[in-house]
Structure formats: structure tokens, C-alpha cells
């Protein structure tokens, strides 16, 4: 018999190589059985994660998931970090393992490097 | 059932580059990362980097960068292992590991691809 | 790169007996989601490592109860409670907190 217990997907030490200037959706998918919980995005500050007030956000639905989207339109160098989502259920928080933004200004690059230059390469990134 | 299917042994001559597949069934290789471990004969294992079928993203070992190449073909649940520029010293047994990315839950290896580098 | 040390690298011991195999990390396997990533595989002869054991002590679906694993920050332990002659095999940890994972050199298990 499956668990109830609210899930959130989130790969532990997941991360996303993306630009400033471009639109992008984080999506942080969560599982439940009846009611959908409360769910929340934070951004890490050391070792506290700073709740994100007044961002534009959004659910979506799919088969056996829906997912809380967090709209970065577009990036900004600032982005650039980590992110976590929680989920308020039954009076408990449910907390995501965080992923990472790594966010490189276009304007600081001649062309656009590969993902895996972005996550070997900090020096291309903000901190 | 669970299963990691590797390619078979290859004999490969110094400065060529050996590509090893693995074809995973049982499980969604999205929720996954593919991590590739090697082991040189009577050694212990050596961690190469980890792939998420996911998205592409790759972490590789400092010692692999530049050499190694990870990647995933979701619509046919198979991993793959790139390595060039092979010398004598990379002759052993590669692993393709299949590590649930969200709780740990599940921990799967495959048999191992024997891969002999001689000139 | 975090060091992992075994001790003892190989052991004789008898059926029945209790073994306990060390692992020291070189800094704390602690991530910042307060848990500990290590892993004990075992490994016999011509095989495929299969995990025993993850987050330090949960058991894999279908290990027996007689393997258990503990400890916390840069000290784990593996325990085999009473052995039996499937368990003779080599043992590693593995780590996979911090970037490069790296492994022990290995527990050779042998018959005494």
C-alpha cells in the first residue's frame, strides 16, 4: 500500500544551469492523496532558508502529480542559488531536498557555455 | 523486476575511446541518478561521476573531466559511459549504479563491462 | 576529496561470530539536510557490489536483520551480529555527501 505521506520530488544536490535574461519555471513536484497541501518556495541564506514572498507562483497538474511552479521572468543574476520547497500538511512541515540555480549573465559570456562547463566551472557563476 | 543490462567486454588499443551502455527495466531512470564506478583488477572501486537521466546533467570526478562523457536515452531506459584517450591504467571493470535521487530508497548496480585497454 | 578508512583492510573469523568493520571519513558526512550519506556495499568475487546498507543504518528490502549499520559525522560502523558463510565477502563504504564520492579501500571478509 503506497505511503499518504506528502511527497516532494526534488533530487537531492539537483541543480539547473540557466541564463539571465531567459524566463524559467522551477517546479517543485508534489504528491498527495485528498486534500493538496500549502506549499511554499525559500530561498537558502547560509544555513536559512529565506521564505519568498509575493513571487509569481502556480500549480499544474498531471496524472499522478501536480507540481508548484516558481516563475523566474525573467532570470536575474541574483537568482542564482539555492532553492527549496515545503509543503504545510497535517501541521507538519514537509521540507525539499534543495536544488541549485546557476545562473550566468549572457552579457559576461561570449557564447553560451554547456551545462557541464556551467556546473565545473564556478568562476562563471554568481554567488 | 529490477534489472542493469551492460554491454559486453572490450578490447580497446591506447588513445581510442570505449563507449559502455546500460540498459536499466523495473524502475523510472527519471527518478534516478546513474552514477559509473570502476574497479582496475584486485583494486577497489573508483567513483567516475553520475548522470541524471533527467535533465542531462552530469557530476564527474576531477580525474574523468575532459575525458569522460555521460548521457541518457530516456525513450529506451539506457545510460551510457564515454571514456577516451584510454590508457593501460583505465583496464577494469566499469559499473553503471542506479541511485533513487529523491529518499535513497533504492540502490541497484549492474554486472559490470570488462574493459581492457592494450596495445 | 573526503578520505574513506577502513579497519580493519581484512579479517578471519568463524561462522556464527559477530564482526564489526569501521569506516572514517576524513570531515563530516553530515549534509545540510542533517543526514549522514553513506552506504555499505558488499561484494564477492566476480560480482557486482550490492548495497547492504544507505543513510547509515536503513537496511536495503531483502538484507538480513544480522547486518546493521551505525555511527554519525566522520565514525560508521557495519555489523555483522552472527555470521554466516554467505557473508564472506569484501565490504566498502561509500560516501555520497560531498563531491568527488569516494570509497574505502575495502574489508576483505575471510573464513577463519
Known amino acids: 500500500k503506497e505511503s499518504c505521506d506528502v511527497q516532494l520530488y526534488i533530487k537531492r544536490q539537483s541543480y539547473h544551469s540557466i541564463f539571465a535574461g531567459d524566463p524559467f519555471k522551477l517546479e517543485c513536484p508534489v504528491k498527495y492523496c485528498a486534500h493538496r497541501p500549502q506549499v511554499t518556495w525559500c530561498k537558502l541564506n547560509g544555513t536559512t532558508c529565506v521564505k519568498l514572498e509575493g513571487r509569481h507562483t502556480s500549480w499544474k497538474q498531471e496524472k499522478n502529480l501536480s507540481f508548484f511552479i516558481l516563475h523566474f521572468e525573467p532570470v536575474l543574476p541574483s537568482d542564482n542559488g539555492s532553492y527549496r520547497c515545503s509543503a504545510n500538511f497535517l501541521s507538519a512541515i514537509i521540507e525539499s531536498h534543495s536544488t541549485t540555480l546557476y545562473v550566468t549573465d549572457v552579457k559576461s559570456a561570449s557564447e553560451r557555455p554547456s551545462k557541464d562547463e556551467m556546473a565545473s566551472r564556478p568562476w562563471l557563476l554568481y554567488s | 523486476q529490477v534489472q542493469l543490462v551492460q554491454s559486453g567486454a572490450e578490447v580497446k588499443k591506447p588513445g581510442a575511446s570505449v563507449k559502455v551502455s546500460c540498459k536499466t527495466s523495473g524502475f523510472n531512470i527519471k527518478d534516478t541518478y546513474i552514477h559509473w564506478v570502476r574497479q582496475a583488477p584486485g583494486q577497489g572501486l573508483e567513483w567516475i561521476g553520475r548522470n541524471d537521466p533527467a535533465n542531462g546533467n552530469t557530476k564527474y570526478a576531477q580525474k574523468f573531466q575532459g575525458r569522460v562523457t555521460m548521457t541518457a536515452d530516456t525513450s529506451t531506459s539506457t545510460v551510457y559511459m564515454e571514456l577516451s584517450s584510454l590508457r593501460s591504467e583505465d583496464t577494469a571493470v566499469y559499473y553503471c549504479?542506479?541511485?533513487?535521487?529523491?529518499?535513497?530508497?533504492?540502490?541497484?548496480w549492474g554486472q559490470g563491462t570488462l574493459v581492457t585497454v592494450s596495445s | 576529496d573526503i578520505q574513506m578508512t577502513q579497519s580493519p583492510s581484512s579479517l578471519s573469523a568463524s561462522v556464527g561470530d559477530r564482526v564489526t568493520i569501521t569506516c572514517r571519513s576524513s570531515q563530516s558526512l553530515l549534509d545540510r539536510d542533517g543526514k549522514s550519506y553513506l552506504n555499505w556495499l558488499q561484494q564477492k568475487p566476480g560480482k557486482a557490489p550490492k548495497r547492504l546498507i544507505y543513510?547509515?543504518?536503513k537496511l536495503d528490502s531483502g538484507v538480513p536483520s544480522r547486518f546493521s549499520g551505525s555511527g554519525s559525522g566522520t565514525d560508521f560502523t557495519l555489523t555483522i551480529s552472527s555470521l554466516q558463510p554467505e557473508d564472506f565477502a569484501t565490504y566498502y563504504c561509500?560516501?555520497?555527501?560531498?563531491?568527488?564520492?569516494?570509497f574505502g579501500q575495502g574489508t576483505k571478509l575471510e573464513i577463519k
Open positions: 543513510l547509515v543504518s
Open positions: 549504479a542506479s541511485y533513487e535521487g529523491y529518499y535513497e530508497r533504492f540502490g541497484y
Open positions: 561509500w560516501q555520497d555527501t560531498h563531491f568527488p564520492y569516494t
